[in-house]
Interface confidence: low
C-alpha cells in the first residue's frame, strides 16, 4: 500500500519520446510501478517500468516510435497513468491528461563542434535532435561557457532568441582550454522547459603570437 | 452496451442558469472524454467543450466565459453548466462520446435535451 | 478557427444516383469525420478519419479527401439515406462542422 502524496511529471520531446517522473512520499514496498499512455487520437498505447532514481522517485521513458517519427501532434490528448501491482490488480496511482506539445522538453543538442577558433574568439555550431517540424523557427537557445576557476553554476547565460544553431564567442583569453554547452527551449507550450544541457565541448584558443595583439 | 441520457432541459428566461446532466453507462466516464454539442433549431452542429477522462476539459472561446463542464465520478455522470442564458442558446444539447479511440468520431450520442430560452 | 464549408446545401436525386457531397476547410486538416441525421434524431456517425467505414455502416457510403477538401459518396442513394449530412473536422479546437447538406429523394 502507498500512503503520502505523489507528484507525477511528463515530458514529451516532440517526436516519438515522453518521459516521466513519479514521486511518492510515502513508503513504497517491492511494487512494480508503470506508466500507462493512452492517447486519444490513435490505436497504440504505450507502457513503460518505473525505475528507482531516488529514495522516492521513479522514472521511466514512454518510447512511442523511432526516434525521429511524429508519434503526436497539437491536439492530441494522452491520457497517463501510474499503475502499481497490488496483489494480482493493478492500482491506479496517479493519472493526468496529457498535452503533449503544452509540456515539451527537447533533446539536448548534440554535434557541437569548433567552427572556427582564434586567439579571442571561438565560433561554434550544432545540431538539434529529434525536434518537431511543427515548430519551424519557433525556437530559442541558451548557452553557456565554462571559464578556468570557475564552475558551470557561475558562467553568464548567453540567449539566442531565435532559432540560430551556431554562436560565436568574443573576449576569449589566449591559450586557454573552455568548455561549452547549449539547450533549447521551444516557444510553444504553458509548461515547456528546457532541454538538458548537452554534453560539453572542450576547446583550446590559440596562443598569442608573441609582440603582436590579436 | 455504450448509452448516453442527457436530463435537465426546459424552458428558462433570458439572464438565467441551468444545469444538465448526461448519465453515462456501458462505460466509466474516468476512461473516455465525453464532449458536449449543440444544435439550434433547423441549424447545424456547433461543439461546445469535452471532459477529458482525466478530468480537464477544453471548451470552444464561445462558451468558455458563461458554460461549465464537469461531472461526478461516483454517479458516471457529467454535467453542463450554463449561466447568463440568451435566446441564441436555445438549442439541442447532446453529450457525445468517441469510440474506443477518442478519435475515431462521435460514434455514441445521447438523445439530446432541448433547452429553450425565451421571456 | 477552421470554418468548415459544406456544398450542395441541399440536393434532390433519385433511388440509384451517385450522390456527391464536398467539404472544404479554411485551413488545412488531418482527419475528416461524416454524420448523418435524421430529423428528431441524434447524428450518427458514418465515416471517420476520412475514409474509414464506421461499425455497421453500410459500404455504398465512403470518404476521401486531404488537405482542405474531402468528398462524401453515397455510391446508390437508397430512400432510407433521406437526412441531413454533415462533415467535421478533428485536427485543430474548436472541433468543427460543416453547415449540413439535405438529401432529398425526387
Known amino acids: 500500500a502507498v500512503n503520502g502524496t505523489s507528484q507525477f511529471t511528463c515530458f514529451y520531446n516532440s517526436r516519438a519520446n515522453i518521459s516521466c517522473v513519479w514521486s511518492q512520499d510515502g513508503a513504497l514496498q517491492d511494487t512494480s510501478c508503470q506508466v500507462h499512455a493512452w492517447p486519444d487520437r490513435r490505436r497504440w498505447n504505450q507502457t513503460c517500468e518505473l525505475l528507482p532514481v531516488s529514495q522516492a522517485s521513479w522514472a521511466c521513458n514512454l518510447i512511442l516510435g523511432a526516434p525521429d517519427s511524429q508519434k503526436l501532434t497539437t491536439v492530441d490528448i494522452v491520457t497517463l497513468r501510474v499503475l502499481c501491482r497490488e496483489g494480482v490488480r493493478w492500482r491506479v496511482m496517479a493519472i493526468q491528461d496529457f498535452k503533449p506539445f503544452e509540456n515539451l522538453r527537447l533533446m539536448a543538442p548534440i554535434s557541437l563542434q569548433v567552427v572556427h577558433v582564434e586567439t579571442h574568439r571561438c565560433n561554434i555550431s550544432w545540431e538539434i535532435s529529434q525536434a518537431s517540424h511543427y515548430f519551424e523557427r519557433h525556437l530559442e537557445f541558451e548557452a553557456r561557457t565554462l571559464s578556468p576557476g570557475h564552475t558551470w553554476e557561475e558562467a553568464p547565460l548567453l540567449t539566442l532568441k531565435q532559432k540560430q544553431e551556431w554562436i560565436c564567442l568574443e573576449t576569449l583569453t589566449p591559450d586557454t582550454q573552455y568548455e561549452f554547452q547549449v539547450r533549447v527551449k521551444p516557444l510553444q507550450g504553458e509548461f515547456t522547459t528546457w532541454s538538458p544541457w548537452s554534453q560539453p565541448l572542450a576547446f583550446r584558443t590559440k596562443p598569442a603570437a608573441l609582440g603582436k595583439d590579436t | 452496451e455504450v448509452q448516453l441520457l442527457e436530463s435537465g432541459g426546459g424552458l428558462v428566461q433570458p439572464g438565467q442558469s441551468l444545469r444538465l446532466s448526461c448519465a453515462a453507462s456501458g462505460f466509466t466516464v474516468t476512461s473516455y472524454g465525453v464532449h458536449w454539442v449543440r444544435q439550434a433549431p433547423g441549424k447545424g452542429l456547433e461543439w461546445v467543450g469535452v471532459i477529458w477522462s482525466g478530468g480537464s476539459t477544453d471548451y470552444n472561446a464561445a462558451f468558455i466565459s458563461r458554460f461549465t463542464i464537469s461531472r461526478d465520478n461516483s454517479k458516471n455522470t457529467l454535467y453542463l453548466q450554463m449561466n447568463s442564458l440568451q435566446a441564441e442558446d436555445t438549442a439541442i444539447y447532446y453529450c457525445?462520446?468517441?469510440?474506443?479511440?477518442?478519435?475515431?468520431?462521435?460514434?455514441?450520442w445521447g438523445q439530446g435535451t432541448l433547452v429553450t430560452v425565451s421571456s | 478557427d477552421i470554418q468548415m464549408t459544406q456544398s450542395p446545401s441541399s440536393l434532390s436525386a433519385s433511388v440509384g444516383d451517385r450522390v456527391t457531397i464536398t467539404c472544404s476547410g479554411s485551413?488545412?486538416?488531418?482527419?475528416m469525420y461524416w454524420y448523418q441525421q435524421k430529423p428528431g434524431k441524434a447524428p450518427k456517425l458514418l465515416i471517420y478519419d476520412t475514409s474509414n467505414l464506421a461499425s455497421g455502416v453500410p459500404s455504398r457510403f465512403s470518404g476521401s479527401g486531404s488537405g482542405t477538401d474531402y468528398t462524401f459518396t453515397i455510391s446508390s442513394l437508397q430512400p432510407e439515406d433521406i437526412a441531413t449530412y454533415y462533415c467535421?473536422?478533428?485536427?485543430?479546437?474548436?472541433?468543427?462542422f460543416g453547415q449540413g447538406t439535405k438529401v432529398e429523394v425526387k
Open positions: 457525445a462520446r468517441a469510440g474506443d479511440y477518442n478519435y475515431d468520431g462521435f460514434a455514441y
Open positions: 485551413s488545412s486538416v488531418s482527419f
Open positions: 467535421q473536422q478533428w485536427s485543430t479546437y474548436p472541433l468543427t
